[in-house]
């Protein structure tokens, strides 16, 4: 869709991972004075929502309240602006934003090798495992917008596991992992218990990533 105006931006508040029955606000905004915003979802159940734009300080925006969250509401969202209503003249679409429902299945376990406390520069691998036959595991880090995804390996000792090599440790962080099934990429398990990875011999325990978007932005395409 080329669009008669440039694309708006689409953000998720508080973030794109949404627990079952909870609500997420998808904010579509632009410095073009759009009178209308349309939010389109592709996924298990396709839908389009419409809101009239609000205008403040040269910015037009619309806040779409999505919830209570259920499987049909998960999917890839795109936002469009329109300066007219009947007919609509749609802008180019926003960058896609994947909204995932979590809390549907039993939580996996998350562990660190060689352990959760490592020396700066030492290699660390996080392992996510479960007795449930998840096809895919997703590793999220607090404060980061997107997740890493790995296929689960074959069943070993009654569990399905994926290993996430983090490489040489520089900064710590709190990690969680989720499991999902191949045919339902937007539907994830409960979160594992959080795992705090600490790096010793390093002055900061934060993860400076100035080039990365905040947790409220659209996450890159990672589900398909």
């Amino acid at each position: 869709h080329e669009g008669v105006h440039r694309k708006p931006s689409l953000l998720a508040h508080p973030g794109p991972l949404v627990k079952s029955e909870e609500t997420v606000i998808l904010q579509c905004w632009s410095d073009v004075r759009f009178q209308h915003f349309l939010l389109h979802r592709e996924g298990k159940f396709k839908d389009t929502l419409h809101l009239i734009g609000e205008h403040h300080d040269g910015v037009s925006k619309a806040n779409f309240s999505i919830g209570p969250m259920m499987q049909d509401l998960a999917g890839t969202y795109r936002c469009y602006g329109s300066v007219t209503h009947s007919p609509y003249q749609l802008s180019a679409p926003s960058d896609p934003l994947d909204i995932v429902i979590t809390g549907l299945y039993e939580k996996p376990s998350l562990s660190a090798q060689p352990g959760p406390t490592v020396l700066a520069g030492e290699s660390v691998t996080l392992s996510c495992s479960s007795r449930s036959s998840y096809d895919m595991y997703h590793l999220s880090r607090e404060g980061e917008a997107h997740e890493r995804r790995f296929s689960a390996g074959p069943k070993v000792n009654g569990t399905f596991q994926a290993d996430f090599p983090l490489g040489p440790a520089t900064h710590g962080g709190t990690y969680r992992c989720f499991g999902s099934f191949r045919d339902s990429p937007y539907e994830w398990s409960n979160s594992s218990d959080p795992l705090l990875v600490s790096v010793t011999g390093n002055p900061s325990n934060s993860w400076p990533s100035p080039t990365e978007p905040s947790s409220e932005t659209g996450n890159p395409r990672h589900l398909h």
Epitope: F45, D47, T48, S65, G67, D72, L73, Y88
Partner: antibody
Framework: QVQLVQSGAEVKKPGSSVKVSCKAS????????ISWVRQAPGQGLEWMGG????????NYAQKFQGRVTITADESTSTAYMELSSLRSEDTAVYYC?????????????????WGQGTTVTVSS | EIVLTQSPGTLSLSPGERATLSCRAS???????LAWYQQKPGRAPRLLIY???SRATGIPDRFSGSGSGTDFTLTISRLEPEDFAVYYC?????????FGQGTKLEIK
């Protein structure tokens, strides 16, 4: 006031197809969610699927997947439902209905405006 | 799919009485996604309640909806002659959207 007006009754042979139309007047058809619901004689209601005209995206109930096609023509504000491989069990009244669209409703699955219904009889 | 079971199948009451219709879901339905309809013979259904408890435009306040999870209720506080009809519940929280089999409300 929005109105939905459907095409007239049809009598069809088993194995054939039927295409029912639903013309909207009033409001903004493009962003409507138009669903199709059928009701066999003396029976309850059954959702078949729906479409949002502006993006042409349709959803179908699994039961009808592959046999039903729902389309919309924005230029004439008309939605269509085509059902193929008809059998006697498809004899029913077919309704088009608009999904309730208010800012606090995130799923347009409650139907506030209905067409008058189209009777489709499948008989050899 | 979610199966909705309505009870009773038929309810015989007199005008002025209170009617209580029940709808039970085979699995939990968010109350945001449950509706009630009234249908009279030869007519299209009419939306009464959406979101389990919100009255649709133009619906008299003698109609009220309540419930959550798997159990939902439509109450008509004081029956008027025009209220005798078939009532259907519907869930739209999980595709395919499904309807109950209906409760027939008849004059005693």
């Amino acid at each position: 006031q929005v109105q939905l007006v459907q095409s007239g009754a049809e009598v069809k042979k088993p194995g054939s197809s039927v295409k029912v139309s639903c013309k909207a007047s009033g409001g903004t058809f493009s962003s409507y969610a138009i669903s199709w619901v059928r009701q066999a004689p003396g029976q309850g209601l059954e959702w078949m699927g729906g479409i949002i005209p502006i993006f042409g995206t349709a959803n179908y109930a699994q039961k009808f997947q592959g046999r039903v096609t729902i389309t919309a023509d924005e230029s004439t504000s008309t939605a269509y439902m085509e059902l193929s491989s008809l059998r006697s069990e498809d004899t029913a009244v077919y309704y088009c209905a608009r999904g309730l669209d208010t800012p606090n409703v995130v799923v347009k699955g409650a139907f506030d405006i209905w067409g008058q219904g189209t009777t489709v009889t499948v008989s050899s | 799919e979610i199966v909705l079971t309505q009870s009773p199948g038929t309810l015989s009451l007199s005008p002025g009485e209170r009617a209580t219709l029940s709808c039970r879901a085979s699995q939990s339905v968010s109350s945001s996604y449950l509706a009630w309809y009234q249908q009279k013979p030869g007519r299209a259904p009419r939306l009464l309640i959406y979101g389990a408890s919100s009255r649709a435009t133009g619906i008299p306040d003698r109609f009220s909806g309540s419930g959550s999870g798997t159990d939902f209720t439509l109450t008509i506080s004081r029956l008027e002659p025009e209220d005798f009809a078939v009532y259907y519940c519907q869930q739209y929280g999980s595709s395919p959207w499904t309807f109950g089999q209906g409760t027939k409300l008849e004059i005693k």
